[in-house]
């Protein structure tokens, strides 16, 4: 048993049929010694008396809020949550496996630049009685500070018959140098509580590996005289790290016909313009990637050819 | 990226082209190591991230873009103790800091070159003959060092008498390649920045 926060405790249980459970000793937070009684939840049924209560926690019915009283007055509460371990593996019932980039990926994180700010998100099919808290640090043995906000519901999607809820959180490394070479990964820890079930999820990464620039901005076409060619120009996204001559991007320019089956023409360039042939009903798209460290490409920025 | 690429003109700055070749070479070598040593802990998640130049050079600090010198988090340890000559310094306007920066890069390359050569000598003794260092990568390191052209004492190649532990050597190779790739990225950024300046 360990304390998650004030008056909230997590009991770690091996979860299998007829498991013996865990013996837990609760202590009433009071200077009083006599006349103390204990109840579970809002029940008036007395479970025991005395400053301490020893209970055998086996299942969810044994979790909940234990209260010690004296003469009708509440002295203190202890909320017990359960953390299930099945076949030696901690349960992951609350969050959905996103399976990208690999199986057992519950948390996904992205950064738009090297400022030390990043966003993580996760999915669940649960919509009520759910709370999350997020902690993060750079490294784990001698952790350096990363500050995370509150997790918020960022999207709802219908997947077949089920609804899926996306939660996200923004974090910022307290003292980040965009040019630094990371040797210790960022650790992100999410505590998830659904009713009386506790689970924790972790992710470890370097900012350089989760970089995904915003799409290029101000995408424009300039037709070239007496030619089917156009000059496509764009700019670095506002959110990208500066100076751009140090944090350089490379770009992919694509000409795509109306039909998905049509052949795509692609050109790669380090410049912020390119000359391409614009076909009727086609569109021109440009995306960006760090020029020197191949993390994710941005989403496409697009303009129609006409 | 095997599709058409509009390549930039190397410009006035002779080291930019070499640094781009260096990054390409080390990235290819790292990819080859990951594939060849698939049953060894060789991915970024599996290895310990060690920097052999730590406390010996300070490339990130010495080569910091002016725009980032206002960021206190970037100014933790600006050790400035490097030699100041070299043929990449094409302009008389080159500042003292730029000289320190390029000198620091040179020292990095020299250290990695020694490590890689020592390691290659061990790998050549491996009866499995599983992996060797790409000669192209070693040549590219050499070319960039020559372009930087700093006068510096030669570091003797480490030789060891004991029988090498090939498993450890291969893991050390992965660690070294990961670290060198990260340093090569920094070098490329620096050269690009200096070229634009």
């Amino acid at each position: 048993i360990w304390e998650l926060k004030k008056d909230v405790y997590v009991v770690e249980l091996d979860w299998y049929p007829d498991a013996p459970g865990e013996m837990v000793v609760l202590t009433c937070d009071t200077p009083e010694e006599d006349g103390i009684t204990w109840t579970l939840d809002q029940s008036s049924e007395v479970l025991g008396s005395g400053k301490t209560l020893t209970i055998q926690v086996k299942e969810f019915g044994d979790a909940g809020q234990y209260t010690c009283h004296k003469g009708g007055e509440v002295l203190s509460h202890s909320l017990l949550l359960l953390h299930k371990k099945e076949d030696g593996i901690w349960s992951t019932d609350i969050l959905k496996d996103q399976k990208e980039p690999k199986n057992k990926t519950f948390l996904r994180c992205e950064a738009k630049n090297y400022s030390g700010r990043f966003t993580c998100w996760w999915l669940t099919t649960i919509s009520t009685d759910l709370t999350f808290s997020v902690k993060s640090s750079r490294g784990s043995s001698d952790p350096q500070g990363v500050t995370c906000g509150a997790a918020t519901l960022s999207a709802e999607r219908v997947r077949g018959d089920n609804k899926e809820y996306e939660y996200s959180v923004e974090c910022q490394e307290d003292s980040a140098c965009p040019a630094a070479e990371e040797s210790l990964p960022i650790e992100v820890m999410v505590d998830a509580v659904h009713k009386l079930k506790y689970e924790n999820y972790t992710s470890s990464f370097f900012i350089r590996d989760i970089i995904k620039p915003d799409p290029p901005k101000n995408l424009q076409l300039k037709p070239l005289k007496n030619s089917r060619q156009v000059e496509v120009s764009w700019e670095y996204p506002d959110t990208w790290s500066t100076p751009h001559s140090y944090f350089s991007l490379t770009f992919c320019v694509q000409v795509q016909g109306k039909s998905k089956r049509e052949k795509k023409d692609r050109v790669f360039t380090d410049k912020t313009s390119a000359t391409v042939i614009c076909r009727k009903n086609a569109s021109i798209s440009v995306r960006a990637q760090d020029r020197y460290y191949s993390s994710s490409w941005s989403e496409w920025a697009s303009v129609p050819c006409s | 990226r095997n599709l058409p690429v509009a390549t930039p003109d190397p410009g006035m700055f002779p080291c930019l082209h070499h640094s781009q070749n260096l990054l390409r070479a080390v990235s290819n070598m790292l990819q080859k190591a990951r594939q060849t040593l698939e049953f060894y802990p060789c991915t970024s998640e599996e290895i310990d991230h060690e920097d052999i130049t730590k406390d010996k050079t300070s490339t990130v600090e010495a080569c910091l873009p002016l725009e980032l010198t206002k960021n206190e988090s970037c100014l933790n340890s600006r050790e400035t103790s490097f030699i100041t000559n070299g043929s990449c310094l094409a302009s008389r306007k080159t500042s003292f800091m730029m000289a320190l920066c390029l000198s620091s890069i040179y020292e990095d390359l020299k250290m990695y070159q020694v490590e890689f050569k020592t390691m290659n000598a061990k790998l050549l003794m491996d009866p499995k003959r599983q992996i060797f260092l790409d000669q192209n990568m070693l040549a590219v390191i050499d070319e960039l060092m020559q372009a930087l052209n700093f006068n510096s004492e030669t570091v003797p190649q480490k030789s060891s008498l004991e029988e090498p532990d090939f498993y450890k050597t291969k893991i050390k190779l992965c660690i070294l390649l990961h670290a060198f790739r990260i340093r090569a990225v920094t070098i490329d950024r620096v050269m690009s920045y200096l070229n634009a300046s």
């Epitope: 809002q42 909940g64 809020q65 099919t125 649960i126 919509s127 009520t128 009685d129 009386l196 | -």
Partner: antibody, heavy 120, light 107 residues
Framework: EVTLRESGPGLVKPTQTLTLTCTLY??????????VSWIRQPPGKGLEWLAH???????YYNPSLKSQLTISKDTSKNQVVLKLTSVDPVDTATYYC????????????WGQGTLVTVSS | DIQMTQSPSSLSASVGDRVTITCKAS??????VAWFQQKPGKAPKLLIY???NRYTGVPDRFSGSGYGTDFTFTISSLQPEDIATYYC?????????FGGGTKVEIK
């Protein structure tokens, strides 16, 4: 002793707004972890959950009725109020409020219910 | 919405009989299932929560089991006072939904 008591108009005309009040005795909605749900049961039919409010004001609604429902609390009076707008004869039902806490997450105490008839 | 399909819709049994009611969820609801008893003209009463936990003061002849999508409610020895309609309810996900009910009568 924990009890909940619903009160409502008994008869409402179609298109009007139905306002129901649940008064709580023996526990306080200002206590951390306390919550109250509303459930209804048309004559001779099953139960339908409508809305829930927690002590901190956080609430959940049945999506099929969300646009018509508003749940609120008056901590000083220890009351929970449910408003259902644009009522229709199909909203004729016995309306129950029930306590649901963040400790056993079950509707453990129910009011006796109040019958509301929607008719012109 | 998660559908809770309860069966049978009604049953008739003798005093002392073992009575079993099942509830099937249209998707996994973990163990977030409660069972209620409702007597004519009265409000429902909580019997079981978290699928298998008997609420305070509920006689031990009432029990529940199940996890995921399949849940069972059992009265080990039917008593005359058990004549009522029994409902299962999931609160894994909003909207919280009830089964259609099972009316239990004495033969």
């Amino acid at each position: 002793e924990v009890t909940l008591r619903e009160s409502g108009p008994g008869l409402v005309k179609p298109t009007q707004t139905l306002t129901l009040t649940c008064t709580l005795y023996g526990f306080s909605l200002s206590t951390s972890g306390m919550g109250v749900s509303w459930i209804r049961q048309p004559p001779g039919k099953g139960l339908e959950w409508l809305a829930h409010i927690w002590w901190d004001g956080d609430n959940y609604y049945n999506p099929s009725l969300k646009s018509q429902l508003t749940i609120s609390k008056d901590t000083s009076k220890n009351q929970v109020v449910l408003k259902l707008t644009s009522v229709d004869p199909v909203d004729t039902a016995t309306y129950y409020c029930a306590r649901r806490t963040r400790v056993n997450y079950a509707m453990d105490y129910w009011g006796q219910g109040t019958l509301v008839t929607v008719s012109s | 919405d998660i559908q809770m399909t309860q069966s049978p819709s009604s049953l008739s049994a003798s005093v002392g009989d073992r009575v079993t009611i099942t509830c099937k969820a249209s998707q996994s609801v973990s163990n977030d299932v409660a069972w209620f008893q409702q007597k004519p003209g009265k409000a429902p009463k909580l019997l079981i929560y978290y699928a298998s936990n008997r609420y305070t003061g509920v006689p031990d002849r009432f029990s529940g089991s199940g996890y995921g999508t399949d849940f069972t409610f059992t009265i080990s020895s039917l008593q005359p006072e058990d004549i009522a309609t029994y409902y299962c309810q999931q609160d894994y996900n909003s909207p919280w939904t009830f089964g259609g009910g099972t009316k239990v009568e004495i033969k």
